[in-house]
């Protein structure tokens, strides 16, 4: 632990002015793991003037950083690049004359205290005023800056010409697009100082490329993947004072796929589990031994989990018997296509026959009751309540 500091497994605090520290505290190799440090408290360190780019990077778990009553004059732009967990920063009563928002733009800070610093009135610190106004909380800090006449001006009163927040405007066509197709988004930004423009595409899977000038840009997304449905795409304008963004949500339409269909499992009810992907929401239909399966209160489709364009559910069967043994086919369709999968289900052996035996399917005379197709999520029973073994003959003819 550096001289003038004390260290524990999770904290470093340096408050002893003598002899004091001249550089940001660093832990010796083979001492405490810097990744476990969550708080650094520095006070009364008049000779600590700079936080360099690599000073803080080892403390990736850092949540609270306090440097008060010290000589801090300069913070490198990328000083906190690796410290994504930082929530509280307190730089009260230091020697900061300027501070860029670039230090903090990637952080989700809940507190930034800058009271008692001799800021110079310029567009460079206008972002602090904007931040204060955005917070509009009762405990607003009393911040001041020195104007050209070396007069202290409340930051709240600071007026600087040609120094304002930028704006972003995203001109998007209908952002509902079919899988495999391509789309181009256009964005224009404005502001003074002239903002930079960039695209925030998050974890977009589809191939994309952008062309960006200072105030105009386009984003071309090609061979759009169904995995990108529901994702947000943002155009961001950024200058010294702050940023603005305009966002759109991408909706990708694609044909259904039955990604999972398994043999029945028994829990509270018997369940033939399935997973279907598709957008728009696919309609489902079950077939039993090649004939439309009549859903009733004894046998019906239940969707248990919907994850955007993925649906997990069961064909739920109440007390099935040997009469329900056979081939179950699930068909899913929407306007973009269809998919079908089949499984064989064996619920129970024939009475008087060893369960391991494999008799032919029962030679039942089926009556043509039929069922309405299921749009996912609609498990309404549209038929009369009839035994769960009733199905429709393959051709739909009555016997």
């Amino acid at each position: 632990c550096p001289t003038s500091c004390k260290c524990s497994a999770s904290r470093i605090w340096c408050s002893d002015p003598s002899p004091g520290i001249v550089a940001f505290p660093r832990l010796e190799p083979n001492s405490v793991d810097p990744e476990n440090i969550t708080e650094i408290f520095i006070a009364n360190q008049k000779r600590l003037e700079i936080i360099n780019e690599d000073d803080v990077e080892a403390y990736v778990g850092l949540r609270n950083l306090t440097i008060v009553d010290s000589g801090l004059k300069f913070v490198a732009h990328k000083a906190f690049l690796k410290n994504s967990n930082l929530q509280h920063i307190n730089f009260t009563r230091n020697k900061l004359t300027s501070l860029s928002r670039k230090h903090f733009r990637h952080l989700d800070l809940s507190e930034l205290i800058l009271v008692g610093n001799p800021f110079t009135c310029s567009c460079d610190i206008m972002w602090i005023k904007t931040l204060q106004e955005a917070k509009s909380s009762p405990d607003t800090q009393d911040l001041y800056c020195l104007n050209e006449s070396s007069k202290n001006i409340p930051l709240a009163n600071l007026q600087i010409p040609n120094c304002g927040l930028p704006s972003a405007n995203l001109a998007a066509p209908n952002l509902t697009v079919e899988e495999g197709k391509s789309i181009t988004l256009s964005c224009s930004v404005a502001g003074d100082p002239v903002p930079n423009m960039y695209w925030d595409v998050g974890n977009l899977v589809s191939k994309h490329m952008n062309e960006t000038s200072h105030t105009q840009g386009s984003l071309r997304i090609t061979n759009i993947s169904s995995d990108d449905s529901g994702k947000q795409i943002s155009c961001v304008a950024e200058n010294l004072v702050g940023e603005d963004q305009d966002s759109v949500n991408l909706t990708v339409h694609f044909a259904p796929t039955i990604t999972f269909l398994e043999s029945p499992t028994s829990d509270h009810h018997w369940c033939i589990p399935f997973t279907v992907k598709g957008n728009p929401k696919p309609a489902l239909q079950w077939f039993y031994n090649g004939a439309i399966l009549n859903e009733s209160k004894y046998i019906c489709t239940k969707i248990h989990v919907t994850n955007h364009t993925e649906y997990h559910g069961c064909l739920q069967l109440d007390n099935p018997t040997h009469m329900n043994n056979g081939d179950y086919t699930l068909i899913a369709k929407n306007e973009y296509g269809k998919d079908e999968k089949q499984i064989s289900a064996h619920f129970m052996g024939w009475p008087g026959i060893d369960d391991g035996a494999n008799p032919n399917y029962p030679d039942v005379i089926y009556e043509d009751y039929g069922t309405a197709a299921n749009d996912i999520g609609d498990t309404t029973n549209r038929s009369n309540e009839i035994p769960s073994t009733d199905v429709t003959d393959k051709t739909g003819r009555e016997h």
């Epitope: 077939f287 973009y336 296509g337 269809k338 309405a372 197709a373 739909g396 009555e398």
Partner: antibody, heavy 119, light 107 residues
């Protein structure tokens, strides 16, 4: 036996309206999706519209979207096609057909009803 | 929309012969192609669906093959009642689309 019988065709003026019906028998109508398909004189088949068994989902061909409406009355075993703003190019023999396997392969067809749009 | 190109548009054959009719889709339609027979005074008849599944009640001399974009209807050992108009139809996605038809005539 499965039977589909269309009716309601006839001569209509351009811009006029007509409602076609399809009476179904010999199967449980409420269990099956239904389609309308048309065939212009000396031309091939053109799909027009589809409705699921419970009327949850409906699709139309672009050529009729906004002008035609497909509907059904399950208790009465009847399929309908309401046609408005009719054009000369809508002149055709209109068939109703059944979606037998939920796969949009049309396993039973009616004989068709003729619609002529002319002034 | 999926375009369906059907060939030939006209075919003359004799009873007992084997003939093939082809349909090509403008993009993949998986296995979802159906074949129909149209005869004057009769309702259209579904012969094959899902590329190769024979519709109930259709004689086994009718068979279908293919997947993706290329499909074939084969009628082996032609019978006199087979001379008719034949259409293919993609039933993978909406709008459903048909081929222009093949007229099978007696040579």
């Amino acid at each position: 036996d499965v039977q589909l019988v269309e009716s309601g065709g006839g001569l209509v003026q351009p811009g006029g309206s007509r409602k076609l019906s399809c009476a179904a028998s010999g199967f449980t109508f409420s269990s099956f999706g239904m389609h309308w398909v048309r065939q212009a004189p000396e031309k091939g088949l053109e799909w027009v519209a589809y409705i699921t068994s419970g009327s949850n989902t409906i699709y139309y061909a672009d050529t009729v979207k906004g002008r035609f409406t497909i509907s059904r009355d399950n208790p009465k075993n009847t399929l309908f096609l309401q046609m408005t703003s009719l054009r000369s190019e809508d002149t055709a023999l209109y068939y109703c057909a059944r979606d037998g396997y939920f796969l949009d392969a049309l396993d039973y067809w009616g004989q068709g009803t003729s619609v002529t749009v002319s002034s | 929309d999926v375009q369906i190109t059907q060939s030939p548009s006209y075919l003359a054959a004799s009873p007992g012969e084997t003939i093939t009719i082809n349909c090509r889709a403008s993009k993949s339609i998986s296995k979802y192609l159906a074949w129909y027979q149209e005869k004057p005074g009769k309702t259209n008849k579904l012969l094959i669906y899902s590329g190769s599944t024979l519709q109930s009640g259709i004689p086994s001399r009718f068979s279908g093959s293919g997947s993706g974009t290329d499909f074939t209807l084969t009628i082996s050992s032609l019978e006199p009642e087979d001379f008719a108009m034949y259409y293919c139809q993609q039933h993978n996605e909406f709008p459903l689309t048909f081929g222009a038809g093949t007229k099978l005539e007696l040579k």
